[in-house]
C-alpha cells in the first residue's frame, strides 16, 4: 500500500452570489467502497470543519440538509460547491479524503484551495 495523494486547485474565486466550486481528486491506493470527504477551513493555525459527507462508491454524495456544501462524485473525483459565502469567509479550504472501508483505512489531505469571496456592492437606488 502507498500514501494517498489528494489534489485540489490552488485558488478559486467565489461568484458574486457567494458560491464557490472546486474539484477534489484523490489517487485511491485500494478498492474503497466507502469514502468520506470533509471540507476543512484553515484560518491562522485554527482548523474547523465546514462540511462532511460519506458515500458509497458509485452512489451520490449526500451532505446533511443544513450543510452549506453540495457535491457530486465520479470515480475518484468529487465536485464540491460551497454556498452562502461572505467576504469574511475568504480563506484556505482543505479537502480531506478518507477511505473508510474496507480496511486498511487511508487518509489523504489536499494542500488547500484559497477561496476569495468579495461581497457584492449594494445596488444604488434607481431614479425614475
Amino acid at each position: 500500500c502507498k500514501a494517498m495523494h489528494v489534489a485540489q486547485p490552488a485558488v478559486v474565486l467565489a461568484s458574486s452570489r457567494g458560491i464557490a466550486s472546486f474539484v477534489c481528486e484523490y489517487a485511491s491506493p485500494g478498492k474503497a467502497t466507502e469514502v468520506r470527504v470533509t471540507v476543512l477551513r484553515q484560518a491562522d493555525s485554527q482548523v474547523t470543519e465546514v462540511c462532511a459527507a460519506t458515500y458509497m462508491m458509485g452512489n451520490e454524495l449526500t451532505f446533511l440538509d443544513d450543510s452549506i456544501c453540495t457535491g457530486t462524485s465520479s470515480g475518484n473525483q468529487v465536485n464540491l460547491t460551497i454556498q452562502g459565502l461572505r467576504a469574511m469567509d475568504t480563506g484556505l479550504y482543505i479537502c480531506k479524503v478518507e477511505l473508510m472501508y474496507p480496511p486498511p483505512y487511508y487518509l489523504g489531505i489536499g494542500n488547500g484551495t484559497q477561496i476569495y469571496v468579495i461581497d457584492p456592492e449594494p445596488c444604488p437606488d434607481s431614479d425614475f
Epitope: 500500500c1 468520506r36 482548523v47 489523504g108
Partner: antibody
Framework: QVQLVESGGGVVQPGRSLRLSCAAS????????MHWVRQAPGKGLEWVAV????????HYADSVKGRATISRDNSKNTLYLQMNSLRAEDTAVYYC???????????WGRGTLVTVSS | EIVLTQSPGTLSLSPGERATLSCRAS???????LAWYQQKPGQAPRLLIY???SRATGIPDRFSGSGSGTDFTLTISRLEPEDFAVYYC?????????FGPGTKVDIK
Amino acid sequence: QVQLVESGGGVVQPGRSLRLSCAASGFTFSSHGMHWVRQAPGKGLEWVAVTWYDGSNKHYADSVKGRATISRDNSKNTLYLQMNSLRAEDTAVYYCTRGDLLGYFDYWGRGTLVTVSS
Amino acid sequence: EIVLTQSPGTLSLSPGERATLSCRASQSVSSSCLAWYQQKPGQAPRLLIYGASSRATGIPDRFSGSGSGTDFTLTISRLEPEDFAVYYCQQYGISPFTFGPGTKVDIK
C-alpha cells in the same frame, strides 16, 4: 478545554475480560476519530484501535484483533474498549487519544493501567 | 504495515546543543501524515509536530520537523533542560497507525 479521562483499569487474571472507558469533554465528540494507544512498562507506544465519527467504522491492530472491541456513545461523549481473553502481554497503560481533524493525535488522557497477572 | 525506524536509540547531549533525530519509514508516507511526540516519565505523550513540519500549538520554535517520502527529521536547535525525554515519530495516513520505537535524549 479538551479533556479525556480514562477509567476501568486494574489487575485482571489471564483469560478474563475488562472494559475501559474514556470520558471526553470540551469538543464536538462526533467530529473526531477516537483512538486507544497503549504502552507496556518500559516500552514504546503501540496503537490499538480507532472508531470513526458515528462508530460504524472501526480498525484494530493485529495484536488485539478478535479480542478487542472499540465503541463509542456520542450521546454520552464516551469511548470504550472491551478487551477479552486477556494475556500477560496486554499489560500496559492504555491511553485514550483524539484524532485531530487533520488526523494527528492532538489530545491524550493520562492513561489507565491494566495489569494482567495471576 | 508501515514500519518506522528511529535513530539513534539514545542521544546523549548537553543543554544548549543541537539534537537531530531521524525517522525512517519502510514505505513512502505522505508528509501530511507524519507526527512527532515527546514523552516524559510518568506522563502521556505530547504532540510536537504534525504534517512533518508544522509545530503544534504552544510548541517552542526550537523544535522543527522536516522530510518527505521515507525520511523524516526532528531537530531541536538548542536543548533546554526540559527537552530531555523520549521522542516518537508516528504515521497516521494508513491503518494500522504506527509509532517508531523512540529516541531517548538524555543529559551527557
